[in-house]
Amino acid sequence: TTPEPCELDDEDFRCVCNFSEPQPDWSEAFQCVSAVEVEIHAGGLNLEPFLKRVDADADPRQYADTVKALRVRRLTVGAAQVPAQLLVGALRVLAYSRLKELTLEDLKITGTMPPLPLEATGLALSSLRLRNVSWATGRSWLAELQQWLKPGLKVLSIAQAHSPAFSCEQVRAFPALTSLDLSDNPGLGERGLMAALCPHKFPAIQNLALRNTGMETPTGVCAALAAAGVQPHSLDLSHNSLRATVNPSAPRCMWSSALNSLNLSFAGLEQVPKGLPAKLRVLDLSCNRLNRAPQPDELPEVDNLTLDGNPFLVPGTALPHEGSMNSGVVPAC
């Protein structure tokens, strides 16, 4: 007997569907109607045939009352080839739901997204997460997707993007976006970051995550942020192979005074990078390759410093004299 594709937990809170059959029984997903958190994995299926069975142009208002009754707040859709028209149809219907967080992963979006009809209402998401989603429309995908969303989006995460740079002139501003996560785009680099951070389109960003994005120096990132007018409070540059030294010919970059938290962990640093902000609330330099203690002008003024997992602190690899103060904690780096 084949296992049930959908499983709903005892609290009717979380429902997970794995449709791995070549011709799945999609009606099984109806048992998720009472769930708050729903995950649907389509096993890499091409959903093109679906278009024949649904009227993508039908007025979604006819489903409004039914959709409003759904409890779903978080929806994850993954592993499928989805026609843009079908995605738009789903977004139009979901606009009447109470959905707040949408995650799309391992999807291939085919075709172009039609423009939002005048009478249509956008989806009022607070969080949109995309991981390994490819778009037939190349660089204009964000602008096309954006028109189907209300302007209140607070969190945007784009990982393993096939085109992490956007067509900036087509993108509208994200006035409420406070968190932007471009992590896990190793090909992005500092030039790509400049292209992705469309100037003045992200005026409210407070948290910017750039883990594993091919960044090279904190100063290079500083320049990209300055060029885009982005002034985050918190910046995560962990899991990049960072160079500590700055090209002497490169112009000095003044960090925004808004920045108070900087994560430089797992960055392969052999010394504290030059050109850091003068004052920070939080600085994470854990799990690097610092083989000697910093001297007083090598660290900014920091309230909360993390250095665990560096060779100079690990007993046996460096020999601090008995009076020096080690953390005693050796994290798994």
């Epitope: 001297q295 002008d297 660290l299 250095l307 020096s324 103060m325 953390s327 005693g328 904690v329």
Partner: antibody, heavy 125, light 108 residues
């Protein structure tokens, strides 16, 4: 065993230049910053400034920005304090002391854990 | 720069007594205060760092406390070997660093 030893003090005339050396041993010289501290007779301790032993960059306290020069001879594990245009107020014992970094769960700083015995400089005509 | 005002400038004390001295910073220095002992004709020795941490090998009769602008150094059971001048120093995470004027311990 960590040791710091100052030398070069003595009786000097006003307007002359004096160089005091601080020889370090028992540790890797470039791993720790070096500070200079002045103590006039019957007086308290006055922090003069410090030098980064990796880069050679000196930092001077406000009262010591004019006639004082910190330098290094890294290969000899030695730091130097040069005082130009000496005057009577420079009569003092000069100490070198190393800054050691400490760290424990978010808290960090530097303290002066090893000091030289000091060298006495008397400026008199 | 930060001024460290140490009080009193001298204390007359008998062996076995408890001694307390104070240090006031002209602005908030968090817990970045160290205490040093200097005996006549010797160089200073570190006793307490980061306001309350006893340095290696320092007897537990020496304690430090305080944060912000007000700091206290205590010797719980005065010994004759403790006769010295005691200095506080603000060691804010970035220089400049400054010493207090010192408190001299003398025998009654």
């Amino acid at each position: 065993e960590v040791k710091l030893l100052e030398s070069g003090g003595g009786l000097v005339q006003p307007s002359q230049t004096l160089s005091i050396s601080c020889k370090a041993s028992g540790y890797t010289f470039t791993d720790y910053a070096m500070n200079w501290v002045k103590q006039a007779p019957g007086d308290g301790l006055k922090w003069m400034g410090w030098i980064n032993t990796q880069t050679g960059k000196p930092t001077y306290a406000d009262d010591f920005k004019q006639r004082f020069v910190f330098s290094l001879e890294t290969s000899a594990s030695t730091a130097y304090l040069q005082i130009n245009n000496l005057n009577i107020e420079d009569t003092a014992t000069y100490f070198c002391t190393r800054s050691t970094f400490y760290y424990s769960s978010y808290i960090y700083g530097w303290y002066f854990d090893f000091w030289g015995p000091g060298t006495m400089v008397t400026v008199s005509s | 720069y930060i001024v460290m005002t140490q009080t009193p400038t001298s204390i007359s004390i008998s062996v076995g007594e408890r001694v307390t001295m104070n240090c006031k910073a002209s602005q908030n220095v968090g817990s970045n205060v160290d205490w040093y002992q200097q005996k006549t004709g010797q160089s200073p020795k570190l006793l307490i760092y980061k306001a309350s941490n006893r340095y290696t090998g320092v007897p537990d009769r020496f304690t430090g406390s305080g944060s912000g602008t007000d700091f206290t150094f205590t010797i719980s059971n005065m010994q004759a070997v403790d006769l010295a001048v005691y200095y506080c120093m603000q060691s804010n995470t970035n220089p400049p660093w400054t010493f207090g004027g010192g408190t001299k311990l003398e025998l009654k």
